[in-house]
Amino acid sequence: RLSSKSVNAQVTDINSKGLELRKTVTTVETQNLEGLHHDGQFCHKPCPPGERKARDCTVNGDEPDCVPCQEGKEYTDKAHFSSKCRRCRLCDEGHGLEVEINCTRTQNTKCRCKPNFFCNSTVCEHCDPCTKCEHGIIKECTLTSNTKCKEEGSRSN
């Protein structure tokens, strides 16, 4: 039985859809992830960002190699014990998005609004088309705010 001081460590588990699941696990060493019991498996060393375990860890201490994530399709941005990389986000055209920064092995895709689309929330999962003005523009559409239109009958200066 573990007799030394136990601490709760947040360890990142990665799944294949590009999503993190944080699980609280108990380990003896605060600074050291060696010998971590993880989901019924026994991983000694985590893989670095951009890599994954070649297969699941086993209880007999057999340590799988780390292999690279698929460039442009998968990534991991943290050290982890999983045999799966995270899936790169797709910037969905149908949600008004386009790629701002391509996915790398260590960083997920960054999306932004397509031209003539805007999003006024902090995290943009969907961008809306900019309003087209019938009677003139007060303020042009930006990435974060819609067009402001002149009302019918309003005078130009």
Partner: antibody, heavy 121, light 111 residues
């Protein structure tokens, strides 16, 4: 409008292979991944795998590796799934579906009409 | 694999009343406050049709009487008020982990 057209039926002999087609129209074919789903008679839905038409990258359900092979022909906006070494267990309706992504939640917004594959001697 | 268990397997609801379908996942399908659960409707001889994505987002063109809710392992599809055309089988589907999996389906009959 967005459409995925599939042949209605295929009758094949045990041990043979069949190549199913899914012709896309009404959108930019290379902008969306294509998914394939199996449905056995009177049963639920089973995900087979997916292909990115922009570069032919594939990702399979482990259960269908060696059984299904996904390809695309971008010139005709058509996705294909080849099923090999067919048995009665492969008799089912096979659907293609367009993939969408909402902040990493992947879902299938438009489905093909489905191809009924019957494996019989 | 994540197993999705739908209940009930079938239900009969009177016209205009509420239909509630449950989907329970064998492990959480959430990440960072978002739920990776989708709902589809399938009528006999037809392909499935998307209703709800990311647990609660109504697909374009789907009537507002359909709504989705839930997080973690417990999700619900509500239909209110139920109409004749809603008679179908409903499936939940998770996209949190590969392989993507579907529930066994719930058959809705209108009384």
């Amino acid at each position: 409008q967005v459409q995925l057209q599939q042949p209605g039926a295929e009758l094949v002999k045990p041990g043979a292979s069949v190549k199913l087609s899914c012709k896309a129209s009404g959108y930019t074919f290379t902008s969306y991944w294509m998914q394939w789903v199996k449905q056995r008679p009177g049963q639920g839905l089973e995900w087979i795998g997916e292909i990115d038409p922009s570069d032919s990258y594939t990702n399979y359900n482990q259960k269908f590796k060696g059984k299904a092979t996904l390809t695309v022909d971008t010139s005709s906006s058509t996705a294909y799934m080849q099923l090999s070494s067919l048995t009665s267990e492969d008799s089912a309706v096979y659907y293609c579906a367009r993939n969408r992504d909402y902040s990493n939640n992947w879902y299938f917004d438009v489905w093909g009409t489905g191809t009924t594959v019957t494996v019989s001697s | 694999d994540i197993v999705l268990t739908q209940s009930p397997a079938s239900l009969a609801v009177s016209l205009g009343q509420r239909a509630t379908i449950s989907c329970k996942a064998s492990q959480s399908v959430d990440y960072d406050g978002d739920s990776y659960m989708n709902w589809y409707q399938q009528k006999p001889g037809q392909p499935p049709k998307l209703l709800i994505y990311a647990a609660s987002n109504l697909e374009s063109g789907i009537p507002a009487r359909f709504s989705g809710s839930g997080s973690g392992t417990d999700f619900t599809l509500n239909i209110h008020p139920v109409e004749e055309e809603d008679a179908a089988t409903y499936y939940c589907q998770q996209s949190n982990e590969d392989p993507r999996t579907f529930g066994g389906g719930t058959k809705l009959e209108i009384k």
